[in-house]
Interface confidence: medium
């Protein structure tokens, strides 16, 4: 006769491991008992369990409640056992020793491999600001056994670097994603992808990029200078900028206080019916936590009764 087993049994942490040991004997042969032991190199054999044809399954106190026979129907020549709820410490070499009559004893070894799936974590880097050089956007760490694979999935241009730390029964892998921040990256997803033989599918953690910036400010509303004349209603100036975080707007007049009746509504400055006292230099001040910008314009309200033309100067200052 001969023993049938597996060279390697692979199981995911927490699952049940079937340790196979089947005696394929000649007719009339009987299995008296099957002894299972752990036989890691450098250590003595530690009994796991013993299946006896007469006395049944005996389990070592160290494995009490964790070793069972497979569910019926059972073949009397089958000495397989189930190791419940596999833990990392179960990984190692096991020996099955079968005592048969009249052929004698047979033994076989197998290796139990316990896969420990990773629980990845993603840590964003420092705040990203436009104008910085190469900056850490995020790091992703995953620990498992064997070592997991950590990669990045993104449309953003950047560079990656990885390092690995080996522990006694596992390995931790950390991958960093570096980039040169630009406003076009705002709202873009940066996804850490972790692959491992113990996972049914890749694990993905997505971080949305936020890049602080503030665009140059400009003022609209003075494009047609002939519209800025005494008596005109609905005249307005609009300050244009964009930023992350979204900016706030403030209007002032450089050559004095804002005239009465002028309404400030965020980025817009609304005028009552125009008079010559509305002529002056107006400043839009745009700011967010990252930066601030100014843009100033000169308003010259025309008196239609005068022949002189209206002159408008546009000046931007940062």
């Amino acid at each position: 006769g001969e023993l049938e087993t597996s060279d390697v049994v692979t199981v995911v942490l927490g699952q049940d491991a079937k340790l196979p040991c089947f005696y394929r004997g000649d007719s009339g042969e009987q299995v008296g008992q099957v002894a299972w032991a752990r036989v890691d190199a450098g250590e003595g054999a530690q009994e796991l369990a013993l299946l006896h044809s007469k006395y049944g399954l005996h389990v070592s106190p160290a494995y009490e409640g964790r070793v069972e026979q497979p569910p019926p129907p059972r073949n009397p020549l089958d000495g397989s056992v189930l190791l419940r709820n596999a833990v990392q410490a179960d990984e190692g070499e096991y020996e099955c020793r079968v005592s048969t009559f009249p052929a004698g004893s047979f033994q076989a070894r197998l290796r139990l491999r316990v896969l420990v799936p990773p629980l990845p974590s993603l840590n964003p880097g420092p705040a990203l600001e436009e104008g910085q050089g190469l900056t850490l956007a995020a790091s992703c760490t995953a620990e498992g056994s064997p070592a997991p694979s950590v990669t990045w999935d993104t449309e953003v241009k950047g560079t990656t670097s990885s390092r690995s730390f080996k522990h006694s029964r596992s390995a931790a892998v950390t991958s960093e994603f570096h980039l040169v921040p630009s406003r076009s990256m705002n709202g873009q997803p940066l996804t850490c992808v972790v692959s491992h033989p113990g996972l049914l599918q890749d694990q993905r953690i997505t971080h949305i990029l936020h890049v602080s910036f503030l665009a140059e400010a400009s003022v609209r509303g003075l494009e047609d200078q002939n519209l800025w004349h005494i008596g005109r209603e609905g005249a307005m100036l609009k300050c244009l900028s964009e930023g992350q975080p979204p900016p706030s707007y403030n209007w002032t007049r450089l050559d004095g206080p804002l005239p009465s009746g002028v309404r400030v509504d965020g980025d817009t400055l609304g005028f009552p019916p125009l008079t010559t006292e509305h002529s002056g230099i107006y400043v839009c001040h745009v700011s967010n936590e990252f930066s601030s910008r100014d843009s100033q314009v000169t308003v010259d309200v025309l008196d239609p009764q005068e022949d002189s033309g209206k002159q408008v100067d546009l000046v931007s200052a940062s």
Partner: nanobody
């Protein structure tokens, strides 16, 4: 030939404890399985518990959680700690040992009486 000698039996009240011992006349390392059976008056011999040379154990459902089998290979002795005894545990308790070579050879002791009164 292996001689097995039991001791520790006696009379005890329900809920009490006893510890049986079985000494073997040769090294228990070569004895693959040792254990205990019992036989009540007018009944068949009944399996109680067994222990392997490596310390793995098995129990009959009727005693699981109340009885504990242990083994001292250095002293060539097997023990049965019996707690929470019940009147239905009254029987003659026999030590058994099995040697595995080309075929199983089973040895028996002469038995020790355990009586549990209510």
């Amino acid at each position: 030939e292996v001689q097995l000698v039991e001791s520790g039996g006696g009379l005890v009240q329900a809920g009490g404890s006893l510890r049986l011992s079985c000494a073997a006349s040769r090294s228990t390392f070569s004895l693959n399985i040792m254990g205990w059976y019992r036989q009540a008056p007018g009944k068949q011999r009944e399996y109680v518990a067994t222990i392997t040379s490596g310390g793995s154990t098995n129990y009959a459902d009727s005693v699981r959680g109340r009885f504990t089998i242990s083994r001292d290979n250095a002293e060539n002795t097997v023990y049965l700690q019996m707690d929470s005894l019940k009147p239905e545990d009254t029987a003659v308790y026999y030590c058994t040992a099995e040697l595995v070579r080309r075929g199983p050879t089973t040895y028996w002791g002469r038995g020790t009486q355990v009586t549990v009164s209510s």
